[in-house]
């Protein structure tokens, strides 16, 4: 099949006092191979500080997955979600407040 780029959506939720959990979701992509990771100042976080979901079919012939990490509130600007799929890449910031940030990566 042809390549379908992912829709990337970054959300945030309060974790514990002074911390927030940021989650980066990629959906609607094909083929299933994808790189999705959190970066701090452009540097990938270590594996033990990130949680990944499995790459799963979403029922439309495409796939979805997610990655999450916990960060200190007030440091959001340092963090971005990095996505690489089929030779294309994109960077996604943490939204301010409780807003959601959508970005569709175009080939």
């Amino acid at each position: 099949g042809s390549t379908v780029p992912p829709m990337v959506n970054v959300t945030r939720s309060e974790a514990s006092e002074g911390n927030i959990t940021v989650t980066c979701r990629a959906s609607g992509f094909y083929p299933w191979n994808i790189t999705l990771s959190w970066r701090q100042d452009g540097v990938s976080l270590s594996h033990d500080t990130q949680q990944w979901g499995d790459v799963l079919p979403d029922g439309n012939g495409t796939y979805q997955t997610w990655v999450a990490t916990r960060i200190c509130q007030g440091e959001e600007q340092r963090f971005t979600c990095y996505m690489e799929h089929s030779g294309n890449h994109s960077t996604h910031p943490v939204p301010s407040g409780n807003s959601h940030h959508h970005h569709h990566h175009h080939h």
Partner: antibody, heavy 118, light 108 residues
Framework: EIQLVQSGAEVKKPGASVKVSCKPS????????IYWVRQAPGQGLEWIGY????????IYNQQFKDRATLTVDKSTSTAYLELSSLRSEDTAVYYC???????????WGQGTLVTVSS | EIVLTQSPATLSLSPGERATLSCSAS???????LHWYQQKPGQAPRLLIY???NLASGIPARFSGSGSGTDFTLTISSLEPEDFAVYYC?????????FGQGTKVEIK
Amino acid sequence: EIQLVQSGAEVKKPGASVKVSCKPSGYAFTSNNIYWVRQAPGQGLEWIGYIDPYIGRIIYNQQFKDRATLTVDKSTSTAYLELSSLRSEDTAVYYCSRSGERSNFDYWGQGTLVTVSS
Amino acid sequence: EIVLTQSPATLSLSPGERATLSCSASSSISSNYLHWYQQKPGQAPRLLIYRTSNLASGIPARFSGSGSGTDFTLTISSLEPEDFAVYYCQQGGSLPLTFGQGTKVEIK
């Protein structure tokens, strides 16, 4: 091969501005942050700031926030550092560097000497 | 701001000797955020060790790094002529990103 090529040496008068360019090659320009660091003669390394070329986000060392401006031109895959209101203490070699997968500075430009003298 | 203090400022050794360089942080740093760079005269720094103990690409195995918390060490097991240079530690855990003042390894 990953390379970062910087513009040539500059001599400036106090109060003037200087703009240094950095052109990386060998990787996708927007996939890694570009950092800027300076080194005064015989001194250590001082971080100025970085820019994410994909989204244009800039983080400055507060010490340089008022005088440094980081920009990128995605059409030419070039990053720029502009430093204004130059003084003699700004005489230094200015380096650009690329953020790495596991460290802040994994490849460096050759450096640009900026001399501020009346 | 996390201040990194390197010691000694200068280390005078002969080729073949062991070099031990220290980097002390003013606040605790996760080992994931401590890196070492080598700089030779007239050249840009180059990444030597990342995340406390991992050798960067092309760096010989005589270099090693260790440490945790506030105390980190770079060791060169047997100095080669090309190892005489200035070495900097750097932390990426908190802003501003900071470097140590450097340790110069010179020929005795």
